[in-house]
Interface confidence: medium
């Protein structure tokens, strides 16, 4: 499986020109796109990650309250080559 790969501040996503493709390790059968955000009294910090992943294809949104820190994770996984665009 081949997936797009990048890590970047999520406010602007990944720069279109700065996109990599990576060959996943044997047994890895999903490409993933995850956006995580943490809200503190100082503001919001967010990160976008694309790459090879594990688990099942699909969409999963989760909100967490970590002792007053609000965290939100949006995960999308797919099982075709370079599908995590």
């Amino acid at each position: 499986l081949e997936c797009y790969s990048c890590v970047q501040k999520a406010d602007d996503g990944c720069s279109p020109n700065k996109m990599k493709t990576v060959k996943c390790a044997p047994g890895v059968d999903v490409c993933t796109e995850a956006v995580g955000a943490v809200e503190t009294i100082h503001g919001q910090f967010s990160l976008a990650v694309r790459g090879c992943g594990s688990g099942l294809p699909g969409k999963n949104d989760r909100g967490l309250d970590l002792h007053g820190l609000l965290a939100f994770i949006q995960l999308q996984q797919c099982a075709q080559d370079r599908c995590n665009a």
Epitope: S5, K9, D12, S15, K18, M19, K20, T21, V22
Partner: antibody
Framework: EVQLLESGGGLVQPGGSLRLSCAAS????????MSWVRQAPGKGLEWVSY????????YYADSVKGRFTISRDNSKNTLYLQMNSLRAEDTAVYYC??????????WGQGTLVTVTS | QSVLTQPPSASGTPGQRVTISCTGS?????????VHWYQQLPGTAPKLLIY???KRPSGVPDRFSGSKSGTSASLAISGLRSEDEADYYC???????????FGGGTKLTVLG
């Protein structure tokens, strides 16, 4: 229809300044990463600078770092390039380009900057 | 000198197949970054021809194809036509320069 229209080029002396503008239309400008790319007469393409959709991420080529400043006004759908301390080697056609899916998918017609004494 | 290396010129006759190479290094193409190709007709702005190694934007004929392997990429033009006469540039992100880099360009001449 996507359109990018550069302006502000012209003749300037070494050490002088110019401000280029690029008026964008036909797409949601505030969602697009934008770049400046230049081409010296008879030479190849050279990326100059680019800026993320919100303006929070900026990159410059080493050749212009500290002299050129890229900026954008999303309310006016306009991209800018402030060029200071200009040198003869900055003489080129300057193109603004939109970053689409992985690449510069639309380019303006270019504006010529000539640095000469 | 460009970070990505292309032959300065290439030529072919109408109907022929021509290939243009683009050689990079471990900080750009070899790092896994996708490769794009641009066509610049005489006196005009560049136009995106191939993106993401081998994808064609709408409106680009399927006579144009791209491929990538290791630290190199190539553009193939089959069924060459006189209107293909242009400069062709490859491009990719470069980690060392922290920006996109272009090849020096290849001037394609259609003979006859």
């Amino acid at each position: 229809e996507v359109q990018l229209l550069e302006s502000g080029g012209g003749l300037v002396q070494p050490g002088g300044s110019l401000r280029l503008s690029c008026a964008a239309s036909g797409f949601t400008f505030s969602n697009a990463w934008m770049s400046w790319v230049r081409q010296a007469p008879g030479k190849g393409l050279e990326w100059v600078s680019y800026i993320s959709s919100s303006g929070s991420t900026i990159y410059y080529a080493d050749s212009v770092k500290g002299r050129f400043t890229i900026s954008r006004d999303n309310s006016k759908n306009t991209l800018y390039l402030q060029m200071n301390s200009l040198r003869a080697e900055d003489t080129a056609v300057y193109y603004c380009a939109r970053e689409g899916l992985w690449a510069f998918d639309y380019w303006g017609q270019g504006t010529l900057v000539t640095v000469t004494s | 000198q460009s970070v990505l290396t292309q032959p300065p010129s290439a030529s072919g006759t109408p109907g022929q197949r021509v290939t243009i190479s683009c050689t990079g290094s471990s900080s750009n193409i070899g790092a896994g970054y996708v490769v794009h190709w641009y066509q610049q007709l005489p006196g005009t702005a560049p136009k995106l021809l191939i993106y993401d190694n081998n994808k064609r934007p709408s409106g680009v004929p399927d006579r144009f194809s791209g491929s990538k392997s290791g630290t190199s990429a190539s553009l193939a033009i089959s069924g060459l036509r006189s209107e293909d006469e242009a400069d062709y540039y490859c491009a990719a992100w470069d980690d060392r320069l922290n920006g996109p880099v272009f090849g020096g360009g290849t001037k394609l001449t259609v003979l006859g």
